[in-house]
Amino acid sequence: GWVWNQFFVPEEMNTTSHHIGQLRSDLDNGNNSFQYKLLGAGAGSTFIIDERTGDIYAIQKLDREERSLYILRAQVIDIATGRAVEPESEFVIKVSDINDNEPKFLDEPYEAIVPEMSPEGTLVIQVTASDADDPSSGNNARLLYSLLQGQPYFSVEPTTGVIRISSKMDRELQDEYWVIIQAKDMIGQPGALSGTTSVLIKLSDVNDNKPIFKESFYRFTISESAPIGTSIGKIMAYDDDIGENAEMEYSIEDDDSKIFDIIIDNDTQEGIVILKKKVDFEQQSYYGIRAKVKNCHVDEELAPAHVNASTTYIKVQVEDEDEPPVFLLPYYILEIPEGKPYGTIVGTVSATDPDRRQSPMRYYLTGSKMFDINDNGTIITTNMLDREVSAWYNLTVTATETYNVQQISSAHVYVQVFNINDNAPEFSQFYETYVCENAESGEIVQIISAIDRDESIEDHHFYFNHSLEDTNNSSFMLTDNQDNTAVILSNRTGFNLKEEPVFYMIILIADNGIPSLTSTNTLTIQVCDCGDSRNTETCANKGLLFIMGFRTE
């Protein structure tokens, strides 16, 4: 049978050939009659057999990491007969490991983020090195990790490569650290190979800093004429944190008058002091307010770092402006009865200079020539007023400072003209009245109504009467309907166009004013040949129209 021991060949041998062992048949008595042969992958190129002795040699440098074993076949032949002495047999040559590979960090680059101020022992990252050597061959691939750079802030677990924090770090002092980790094989024994890797450890921000005002005192000025919403000035607080942890909000602590407010400029994180109410130099020339700043987002566990919020004092100086005059009232409503003589005082308006110098005023009036104003602000009539012409006057009074005529203010003055009963009622229209020749007694000839140009506090009430003076006109009669209308009735049967073509009826209309006014009105009644229809609608076309005027007494 075959005789051999396990074959091993060390990798990376530099010799031209290396004796591995001997293959032989136990039938080989050394009579020089056997020939040994090697077959299979690597035979003749990597491995050579001395065909006389069965000695096997490696003639190439081998790399276990490339190939760790070779399976070959052995033959032994009797030279004399050419026949196999033993059955062909498979055998294995194992390439034994030497420590020829250094540990390598395959997952580079390493980068980790850990919150600042993390406590000792906090896990940062695990780095892992790989060693291509045989893990089952001694300590060739057994690794130990150590820290070459990064003390005293970091430590590494020797067997796991876990990096932990060993000292608290403040991002505001240094925000990133380069840690160098070394991995050594042979568990660090002499002859060990090593590899290193760099780990970039970035500290993420925690809100461990409160915002602090850059200045403890700010001085701003604002014109008293500044409108609401005006930016008065900017205040600035600094927070060493970043991002959301540096977001801040400003507030005003001492401002009982609620005149100021602070809004934030999100781009610059500045506080903008704005005007919430108008200021008046003459009322208050400066304001002292205190502003406070705090972070928008504070975790409970970091609250102790945020007690005693930073404050700053802001002095706002109000600048005096030459202000225009100010009327006592925003507008005026004055009343005057109609019919008063010119020069009658309607009322008085008053404007004053809000500034300390108290300039005298000069007044101007526009909107109607019926009024004038003097330097005291007294408005008088320049004409007699007739309510029936205009019941209201819309005037504009302009006040100007005599010291500075550019400073002008205006106020509206509304003058209401009161009614007095100075107008008698009269026919509401011109009546074209016709009566048919064949009219019967009691037949309605005309319904009349009146108007009164006066204003009535209550409703107007008109009284209609046939004038007693109109004695020659008994052909018609008047009936007051008590509803501000009256009806004219035929008082006879039949009229003669040729003999009496026209009748003039004098009608008195009185109002209910105090005192009452009465007007005399003449109603012209024309006789018309209506035919059988007794319809006066065609009468106007017959050229019988007599245009008569009104007469009012």
Epitope: T16, S17, H19, N31, N32, I48, D50, R52, I77, I79
Partner: antibody, heavy 122, light 108 residues
Framework: QVQLQESGPGLVKPSETLSLTCTVS????????WSWIRQPPGKGLEWIGY???????NYNPSLKSRVTISVDTSKNQFSLKLSSVTAADTALYYC????????????????WGQGTMVTVSS | DIVLTQSPGTLSLSPGERATLSCRAS???????LAWYQQKPGQAPRLLIY???SRATGIPDRFSGSGSGTDFTLTISRLEPEDFAVYYC?????????FGQGTRLEMK
């Protein structure tokens, strides 16, 4: 064609080590067996031993304890070391190549060097 | 070890004659692995015959070998002047390789 050339000191003191080198030119040392043979003055030939190019050796039992044959394929050379020499080791030393007339076992020597004379004397 | 005995020790012949050299082994030579060499003064041996009967490259056909087992013969059919030299037989069928003591072929 392949030629062999022996080299080494011609005089060696008794008890010292005789060292010779055979340089192969005109061909490769690979795939052949290479022998050392000596011939004392006026006497016949004695085979000392061979080396296979991979380093496998076989020595004459009569000299085995004192002989070392080695090969350096990079230089195309093989060497002989004979330790503890005496006057009986004075001889003409030849290097020779076994032919490949047949596949397998030992073969005849088809190429010889011209020989180098080594005298052992104090 | 296999001991090879060559005879005669010296053989005196004239050119043109036939020479027969003998080599006897102390035990059978496996595979007829026997060779013949020619050595002239001041020269290295030269291979003539291998495998008992095969002529080496460039050897004239007047040289022939025969035999098996323990008895082997080298024959030179017609001696040429350059053939006068010392002839050695060698067995390489079993380690160690051994040579005969040699036969001197001299011109008569």
């Amino acid at each position: 064609q392949v030629q062999l050339q022996e080299s080494g000191p011609g005089l060696v003191k008794p008890s010292e080590t005789l060292s010779l080198t055979c340089t192969v030119s005109g061909g490769s040392i690979n795939s052949y067996y290479w022998s050392w043979i000596r011939q004392p003055p006026g006497k016949g030939l004695e085979w000392i031993g061979y080396i296979y190019y991979i380093g496998s050796t076989n020595y004459n039992p009569s000299l085995k304890s004192r002989v070392t044959i080695s090969v350096d394929t990079s230089k195309n050379q093989f060497s002989l070391k004979l330790s503890s020499v005496t006057a009986a080791d004075t001889a003409l030393y030849y290097c020779a190549r076994e032919s490949r007339y047949r596949s397998g076992w030992y073969d005849a020597f088809d190429i010889w060097g011209q020989g180098t004379m080594v005298t052992v004397s104090s | 070890d296999i001991v090879l005995t060559q005879s005669p020790g010296t053989l005196s012949l004239s050119p043109g004659e036939r020479a027969t050299l003998s080599c006897r082994a102390s035990q059978s030579v496996a595979g007829s692995y026997l060779a013949w060499y020619q050595q002239k003064p001041g020269q290295a041996p030269r291979l003539l015959i291998y495998g008992a009967s095969s002529r080496a490259t460039g050897i004239p056909d007047r040289f022939s070998g025969s035999g098996s087992g323990t008895d082997f013969t080298l024959t030179i059919s017609r001696l040429e002047p350059e053939d006068f030299a010392v002839y050695y037989c060698q067995q390489y069928g079993k380690s160690p390789i051994t040579f005969g003591q040699g036969t001197r072929l001299e011109m008569k």
